[in-house]
Amino acid sequence: IWELKKDVYVVELDWYPDAPGEMVVLTCDTPEEDGITWTLDQSSEVLGSGKTLTIQVKEFGDAGQYTCHKGGEVLSHSLLLLHKKEDGIWSTDILKDQKEPKNKTFLRCEAKNYSGRFTCWWLTTISTDLTFSVKSSRGSSDPQGVTCGAATLSAERVRGDNKEYEYSVECQEDSACPAAEESLPIEVMVDAVHKLKYENYTSSFFIRDIIKPDPPKNLQLKPLKNSRQVEVSWEYPDTWSTPHSYFSLTFCVQVQGKSKREKKDRVFTDKTSATVICRKNASISVRAQDRYYSSSWSEWASVPCS
Amino acid sequence: RNLPVATPDPGMFPCLHHSQNLLRAVSNMLQKARQTLEFYPCTSEEIDHEDITKDKTSTVEACLPLELTKNESCLNSRETSFITNGSCLASRKTSFMMALCLSSIYEDLKMYQVEFKTMNAKLLMDPKRQIFLDQNMLAVIDELMQALNFNSETVPQKSSLEEPDFYKTKIKLCILLHAFRIRAVTIDRVMSYLNAS
């Protein structure tokens, strides 16, 4: 058993049928010695008396808010949560496996630049009685500071018969140098509590590996005289690290017909302009990627050919 | 410890091409190592990230773009002195700091070159003959060093009398390639910045 926060405790259980569970001793936080009784949740049934209460925690019915009283007055509370270990592996019932970039990915994180700011998000089908708490650090043995905000519900979507909820959090490394070469990964730890179930999820990454630039901005077309060709131009996104000559991007320019089946013409360039043939009803899209370290491509920025 | 903006004319920077070749070569070599050594811990998640140049050179700090010198987190006070006569500098007005930056890069390349050559000698003794260092990568390191053209004491190749542990050597190769790829990215960024300045 360990303390998650004041008066909230997590009991770790080896979870299998007929498991013996864990013996837990609760102590009433009071100078009083006699006349103390114990109850669980809203029940008025007295579970025991005395300054300590010994219970055998086996299942969720044994978890909850234990309260000690004296003469009708509440003295203190202890909330017991359960953390299930199933055949040596901690349960992952609360969050959905996003399966990207690989199986068992519960937390996904992205950064728009090298400033040390990043966003993580996760999915669940649970809509109520759900709380999250996020901590982060650079490295684990001698951790350096990363500050995270509160997790918020960022999207809701319908998937088949189920509703899916997306939560996200923003974090900022306390003293980040955009040009630094990372040798210790960022660690992100999410505590999830659903009713009386506790779970924790972790992700470990280097900022360089989760970079995904914003799409190029100010995408414009300039027709070339007496030609079907156009000059496409764009700019680095505002959120990208500066100076741009040091944090350079490379670009992919795509001409896409109305029909998805039509052949796509693609050009790769390090410049912020390109000359392409603009077909009728086609659109031109441009996306960006770090020129020197191949992390994710940005989303496409698009303009119609007409 | 920053790079001045008024430096060589655009396109007059012969090291840019070599640094791009270097990044391409080390990236290909790392990919090959990850595929060949699939049963070894060779992915970024599995290896320890060690920097053999730590406390010996200070490339990131010495090559910091002027715009980042206002960022206190970037100003680690690790001073290292270097020789200052490089031929990548197409202008005579090169500041001391830029020479310091380029000589720091040169020292990095020299250290990695020695490590890779020592390692290759061990890998050639492996009866499994599973993996060797790409000669193209070693050649590209050499070309960039020549383009930088710093006079520096030659570091003797390390020779080991004991029987090599091939498993450990292959893991060390992965660690070295990961670190060298990160340094090659920094070198490419620096050369691109200097070329644009």
Epitope: D14, W15, Y16, P17, E86, D87 | P41
Partner: antibody, heavy 115, light 112 residues
Framework: QVQLVESGGGVVQPGRSLRLSCAAS????????MHWVRQAPGKGLEWVAF????????YYADSVKGRFTISRDNSKNTLYLQMNSLRAEDTAVYYC????????WGQGTMVTVSS | QSVLTQPPSVSGAPGQRVTISCSGS????????VKWYQQLPGTAPKLLIY???QRPSGVPDRFSGSKSGTSASLAITGLQAEDEADYYC????????????FGTGTKVTVLA
Amino acid sequence: QVQLVESGGGVVQPGRSLRLSCAASGVTFSSYGMHWVRQAPGKGLEWVAFIRYDGSNKYYADSVKGRFTISRDNSKNTLYLQMNSLRAEDTAVYYCKTHGSHDNWGQGTMVTVSS
Amino acid sequence: QSVLTQPPSVSGAPGQRVTISCSGSRSNIGSNTVKWYQQLPGTAPKLLIYYNDQRPSGVPDRFSGSKSGTSASLAITGLQAEDEADYYCQSYDRYTHPALLFGTGTKVTVLA
């Protein structure tokens, strides 16, 4: 004492369907994940499928994906395996088992796919 | 196709010590715990070892398990006639959990 009893096995022609059941007693069935495991005659153990305690997630071996469906009815304390498009290579003893460090197995039910 | 490899058979005289190996990789045994099962002819598998080296109550202390790196092993000391059976190791892969990974199985023969 936990007890698992499989039923529904038998002889069936290739391409046909069969539904296996696993009745659980002596256990808070709705609290635990459940597996199906099979064993072809003279061969080793092969995992078939898994279902979470609440039925929210299901996992399948590649060899049965798209043909077999695992399900459970927690009100009836019963686990099911719906087997469609059966093949000769599905011939085996099918066991249900609880998920956990200490597991419980049923006695198995024989499925024979033969023309 | 099992990814946990066991020797097809091992044998020993009564009273002898035999060991069965179970070889995996970093993503399965290297990252997860190992179980061992005993299967007597015509019966369901019976749990012998869980969490690499723990014995459930009722399993004789002649059976012991261990794990090192990407391999595990089961040792039977003081071999007895009733130990003649098939033995399977089981683990998980970190990317496909909760799919059970079983070993190829080992037939233990007690020599007369």
